[in-house]
C-alpha cells in the first residue's frame, strides 16, 4: 500500500518542517490517491490489453464519468475559485460509486483499491471544509447509484475490464486537473 499522507517516502527529511497547511494537506492527499491509482492501473494493464485498446469510446458512452470542462471554472480562462471547488467536490462524490465498483476488481491490489476509496472520502472532507458554498454541491442519489452499481457488475468480463480501465484513467485525469486548479487557489 502507498505511504499515508504525512509520511511521504518521497519527501526530503526535514526534522523542523512546519505542520502542513490545509492546502498542503489537500495537495498531499491527492498525490497519495494518484499513487494508488497508478498501482491499480499497473495491475489492470498487466492483466488485459485494455490500456492499448482503441475501442474505449464504445464503453465510454455508457459511463457518465466526471470530467473537467471550461465551464466548470477550473481552467485558467474563466477561473472561478468557488465554482471550481464545487465542481471538484461534486465530481469526487460522483466518482464514489465507481470507486465502490472497483473494490472487487483487483486480486493482488485489493488493499490498494480500498485505500484509494477511503482516501477519496477523506479528500472530500478536506475540500468541504475549504468550500464556502456547500449548498451548491449536489450529492448523488443513493438509489440511482445502487442501480448503476448493479448494472456495471452485471456486464460481461470484457466490458468489466474496459470499465475498470476507464474509471482509473478518468479518475486520474480528474485528480490531475483538480490538483492543478487547487494550486491556483
Amino acid at each position: 500500500a502507498p505511504v499515508p499522507p504525512g509520511e511521504d517516502s518521497k519527501d526530503v527529511a526535514a526534522p523542523h518542517r512546519q505542520p502542513l497547511t490545509s492546502s498542503e494537506r489537500i495537495d498531499k492527499q491527492i498525490r497519495y490517491i494518484l499513487d494508488g491509482i497508478s498501482a491499480l492501473r499497473k495491475e489492470t494493464c498487466n492483466k488485459s490489453n485494455m490500456c492499448e485498446s482503441s475501442k474505449e469510446a464504445l464503453a465510454e458512452n455508457n459511463l457518465n464519468l466526471p470530467k473537467m470542462a471550461e465551464k466548470d471554472g477550473c481552467f485558467q480562462s474563466g477561473f472561478n475559485e468557488e465554482t471550481c471547488l464545487v465542481k471538484i467536490i461534486t465530481g469526487l462524490l460522483e466518482f464514489e460509486v465507481y470507486l465502490e465498483y472497483l473494490q472487487n476488481r483487483f486480486e493482488s491490489s485489493e488493499e490498494q483499491a480500498r485505500a484509494v476509496q477511503m482516501s477519496t472520502k477523506v479528500l472530500i472532507q478536506f475540500l468541504q471544509k475549504k468550500a464556502k458554498n456547500l449548498d451548491a454541491i449536489t450529492t448523488p442519489d443513493p438509489t440511482t447509484n445502487a442501480s448503476l452499481l448493479t448494472k456495471l457488475q452485471a456486464q460481461n468480463q470484457w466490458l468489466q475490464d474496459m470499465t475498470t480501465h476507464l474509471i482509473l484513467r478518468s479518475f486520474k485525469e480528474f485528480l490531475q486537473s483538480s490538483l492543478r486548479a487547487l494550486r491556483q487557489m
Epitope: 526530503v12 497508478s38 473537467m68 481552467f75 485558467q76 480562462s77 490531475q176 492543478r180
Partner: antibody, heavy 124, light 107 residues
C-alpha cells in the same frame, strides 16, 4: 523519439503580430499529462516562461504578457502555436517550445524535451 | 507570482571542485522544482525534477534536494564539460517561474 522544432518570421517590425509554430513528434498532445510550453530568452539573459497548453486544452499565460498572448494547438498535426500581438524591441529573443510532461504518478511536471529555439528580432 | 531567488550568480571553480547552488522560493512549492543546464548556444536540458530525481542519462555527480521554499543543487566533482548556466524552475503553480541563473566557469 521526441523532437520539437520552432519556426517563426525571424525579423518583424514593432506593433506587428508575432506568430510562432512548434512542430513536434514522438508524443501526442491528446495523451493525459502532456503539454507544451513556450519560453523565451533575450540574448545573454535568463529564461522567461510565456504560456502553456495542457492535453485537456487548459491554457496558462504569464500574467505580465497575458493580454498579448494566445496559445493554441492542433492535435491532429502535432503543432502548438503562439501569437504575440503589438511586438516591441523588448520582444527580441530566442523563443523555445518545450514538452512539459507529467512525471511519476503525481501532479508534478518537468520540461523534459526542448526545441533548438528560433531567433526573433523586432526592429524598425 | 512565485519568485525564485537563485544564488550565486557566478561561480568560478576548478575541475574536481564541489559546487552548490541554492534556490529560494517566495512561497512553498512542495517539491515541484526542476534544475536545467544550458550550455553556450544550446537549449536548456533537464537535469533534476521533483527536487531530487535525476533525469534519465544524467550523471550521478548532479544531485538536488529541498522541500517547501529552500532547494539546493550540487555538482559533487565538477568536470570541464559542466561549463554552463544552471537554472532552477518551479512547476507548482503558473506562472512557472525560473531562477535568474548561475553561470559556472572553469578556471
Amino acid at each position: 523519439q521526441v523532437k520539437l522544432e520552432e519556426s517563426g518570421p525571424g525579423i518583424l517590425q514593432p506593433s506587428q503580430t508575432l506568430s510562432l509554430t512548434c512542430s513536434f513528434s514522438g508524443f501526442s498532445l491528446s495523451t493525459s499529462g502532456m503539454g507544451v510550453s513556450w519560453i523565451r530568452q533575450p540574448s545573454g539573459k535568463g529564461l522567461e516562461w510565456l504560456a502553456h497548453i495542457y492535453w485537456d486544452d487548459d491554457k496558462h499565460y504569464n500574467p505580465s504578457l497575458k493580454s498579448r498572448l494566445t496559445i493554441s494547438k492542433d492535435t491532429s498535426t502535432n503543432q502548438v502555436f503562439l501569437k504575440i500581438t503589438s511586438v516591441d524591441t523588448a520582444d527580441t529573443a530566442t523563443y523555445f517550445c518545450a514538452r512539459r510532461s507529467l512525471y511519476g504518478n503525481w501532479g508534478d511536471y518537468a520540461m523534459d524535451y526542448w526545441g533548438q529555439g528560433t531567433s526573433v528580432t523586432v526592429s524598425s | 507570482d512565485i519568485l525564485l531567488t537563485q544564488s550565486p550568480k557566478f561561480l568560478l571553480v576548478s575541475a574536481g571542485d564541489r559546487v552548490t547552488i541554492t534556490c529560494k522560493a517566495s512561497q512553498s512549492v512542495s517539491t515541484d522544482v526542476s534544475w536545467y543546464q544550458q550550455k553556450p548556444g544550446q537549449s536548456p536540458k533537464l537535469l533534476i525534477y521533483y527536487a531530487s530525481n535525476r533525469y534519465t542519462g544524467v550523471p550521478d555527480r548532479f544531485t538536488g534536494s529541498g522541500y517547501g521554499t529552500d532547494f539546493t543543487f550540487t555538482i559533487s566533482t565538477v568536470q570541464a564539460e559542466d561549463l554552463a548556466v544552471y537554472f532552477c524552475q518551479q512547476d507548482y503553480r503558473s506562472p512557472f517561474t525560473f531562477g535568474s541563473g548561475t553561470k559556472l566557469e572553469i578556471k
